[in-house]
């Protein structure tokens, strides 16, 4: 039976590589995937023309982090 990606078990992973514009970093498999495969929209880099992620936001929920926390400019760094 497939058991999926291994947990880091406390070992630091390298910082995620920035993804190309049409891709987003999947934190569970720890690599870039097509943004459209994920449920949650990622903030787009300023001026980016890549297609918007597939899903709508949760009602009243901003895709950015909470107060005082700026969204990072590259989806791959989330």
């Amino acid at each position: 039976m497939r058991r999926g990606p291994r947990s880091l078990r406390g070992r630091d992973a390298p910082a995620p590589t920035p993804c190309v514009p049409a891709e987003c970093f999947d934190l569970l498999v720890r690599h870039c995937v097509a943004c459209g495969l994920l449920r949650t929209p990622r903030p787009k880099p300023a001026g980016a023309s890549s297609p918007a992620p597939r899903t709508a936001l949760q009602p009243q929920e901003s895709v950015g982090a909470g107060a005082g926390e700026a969204a990072l400019p590259l989806p791959g760094l989330l």
Epitope: L8, L27, T55, G66, L78
Partner: antibody, heavy 118, light 113 residues
């Protein structure tokens, strides 16, 4: 808005099997990560496993391969097949959608009770 | 797996009280990307859990401002500044930094004094 509805719970004898269903509406299970979480009576929450957009699965190692998660994308439903059930598997089983940007469970089903008893 | 330990397991408080619940993880919850994926859920009897706070200190949509979260590394706190009747429930911390598996604390039950 995403909604999840579980079904399939009930009474089963030790050693028996049961399949739970979670029907999703408002979003497609072809995208993201779809989870099962359980809660024994009077106890805390325990993550069971997920099925991903690609159909890959990952399970809590404590379950020792007795549980299998699958999906039927045509019905927008995913399942938890439970085999070799034990009394300690008695719990309310919730399905939950993962916010895969911030890694929290943002949508939960209402829960379905599984009782393992002779 | 990461162990999450909450304290106290239960507490009795009155409406208007300030309530503090602590959560400690068995290792640092700072992800290699710099984020800390520590969340808090509220659960009422017979109901599914509901997200309150995500990533240590961010209130989820619709959560009243009396709920706040703080902490870093391995030690985290959920504070209810002025307890309201609807806040009597069980609260769980959860980590998503070292996943899978996702892990939860054992819960803190907030009861009426």
């Amino acid at each position: 808005e995403v909604q999840l509805v579980e079904s399939g719970g009930g009474l089963v004898q030790p050693g028996g099997s049961l399949r739970l269903s979670c029907a999703a509406s408002g979003d497609s299970i072809n995208f993201g990560y779809w989870n099962w979480v359980r809660q024994a009576p009077g106890k805390g929450l325990e993550w069971v496993g997920y099925i991903s957009y690609s159909g890959s699965t990952y399970y809590n190692p404590s379950l020792k391969s007795r549980f299998t998660i699958s999906r039927d994308t045509s019905k927008n439903t995913f399942y938890l097949q439970m085999n070799s059930l034990r009394a300690e598997d008695t719990a309310v089983y919730y399905c939950a959608a993962l916010n895969d940007l911030f890694l929290y469970f943002d949508v939960w089903g209402q829960g379905t009770l599984v009782t393992v008893s002779s | 797996d990461i162990q999450m330990t909450q304290s106290p397991s239960s507490l009795s408080a009155s409406v208007g009280d300030r309530v503090t619940i602590t959560c400690r993880s068995s290792q640092s919850l700072v992800h290699s990307n710099g984020n800390t994926y520590l969340h808090w859920y509220q659960q009422k009897p017979g109901k599914a859990p509901k997200l309150l706070i995500y990533k240590v200190s961010n209130r989820f949509s619709g959560v009243p401002s009396r709920f706040s979260g703080s902490g870093s590394g391995t030690d985290f706190t959920l504070t209810i500044s002025s307890l309201q009747p609807e806040d009597f429930a069980t609260y769980y911390c959860s980590q998503s930094t070292h996943v899978p598996p996702f892990t939860f604390g054992q819960g803190t039950k907030v009861e009426i004094k």
